[in-house]
Interface confidence: low
């Protein structure tokens, strides 16, 4: 069965720093999402070989990619406190397969000692299903937007 290997399990970084998240699969996928989990999960990026990556506007200009969709390293730059959270890779195959998640802890530089990662990987056993529909915010040219749950006029 298809699996997604994701690393690191957890990382603590100061505000303004960068973090690398690597998503590896055995191939045979159509594309890969990086999804920020939480009460309202958000798709951060969609990456597909041969296609210009789509990045959520909150991370526009702060994401770099290296490798291919089968072994993708996503670099998030200029991290902010609000970027703290668990990020999971989702491989789009015949079925959707999730990685184990990466907990990113963004801290004020002087408080790093109080916030450290434990050795245990984040749990990925209860990941939410992708939401449907989308809400339309203020116009922004070619803005890539996550889809919060919302009713849709079409099936």
């Amino acid at each position: 069965a298809q699996e997604v290997q994701q690393s690191p399990h957890c990382t603590t970084v100061p505000v303004g720093a960068s973090v690398n998240i690597t998503c590896s699969t055995s191939g045979g996928l159509r594309g890969i999402y990086l999804r920020q989990l939480g009460p309202q999960p958000q798709d951060i990026i969609y990456y597909e070989d041969g296609v210009v990556p789509t990045t959520d506007r909150r991370f526009r200009g702060r994401i770099d990619f290296s490798g291919s969709q089968d072994n993708l390293t996503i670099t998030m730059h200029r991290l902010q406190l609000s970027d703290t959270g668990t990020y999971t890779c989702q491989a789009i195959t015949e079925v959707n397969v999730y990685g184990s998640g990466t907990l990113v802890l963004v801290t004020e530089e002087q408080s790093q000692g109080w916030h450290r990662c434990s050795d245990a990987p984040p749990r990925a056993s209860a990941l939410p299903a992708p939401p449907t529909g989308s809400a339309l915010p203020d116009p922004q040219t070619a803005s890539a937007l996550p889809d919060p749950p919302a009713a849709s006029a079409l099936p």
């Epitope: 159509r30 999402y33 296609v51 889809d147």
Partner: nanobody, 123 residues
Framework: DVQLQESGGGSVQAGGSLRLSCPAS????????MGWLRQAPGKEREEVAT???????TYADSVMGRFTISRDNANNALYLQMNDLKPEDTSMYYC?????????????????RGQGTQVTVSI
């Protein structure tokens, strides 16, 4: 990056017609679901029409039989022919695409859209 730019909006009297166009660039246009959205001030967003890569269209009930969505994969363009326009069609119209599983309009996640073009229909 993905770029979408709508054109063709304007003012028209009820019963008139307009044709919206949306050239796309920055990605493999033919691989993805496309659609037209609209939103009037103070009103809910409405998906007017979507079109799969095999050119299968889906329409909102409110525009069925009056609007026709089409795509030109060779020229990376999306169109919306709007006939028999009504005052309630007045809105900002947005061209949109959804990144995700290729082909299907049923797996839509990251939405990309243009700045919009205003359509105003007067009595």
């Amino acid at each position: 990056d993905v770029q979408l730019q709508e054109s063709g909006g304007g003012s028209v009297q009820a019963g008139g017609s307009l044709r919206l166009s949306c050239p796309a660039s920055g990605y493999t246009f033919s691989h993805y679901c496309m659609g037209w959205l609209r939103q009037a001030p103070g009103k809910e967003r409405e998906e007017v029409a979507t079109i799969d890569t095999d050119s299968t269209p889906t329409y909102a009930d409110s525009v069925m039989g009056r609007f026709t969505i089409s795509r030109d994969n060779a020229n990376n363009a999306l169109y919306l022919q709007m006939n028999d326009l009504k005052p309630e069609d007045t809105s900002m119209y947005y061209c949109a695409t959804w990144m995700g599983l290729r082909g299907s309009c049923h797996d839509r996640r990251l939405e990309v859209r243009g700045q919009g073009t205003q359509v105003t229909v007067s009595i």
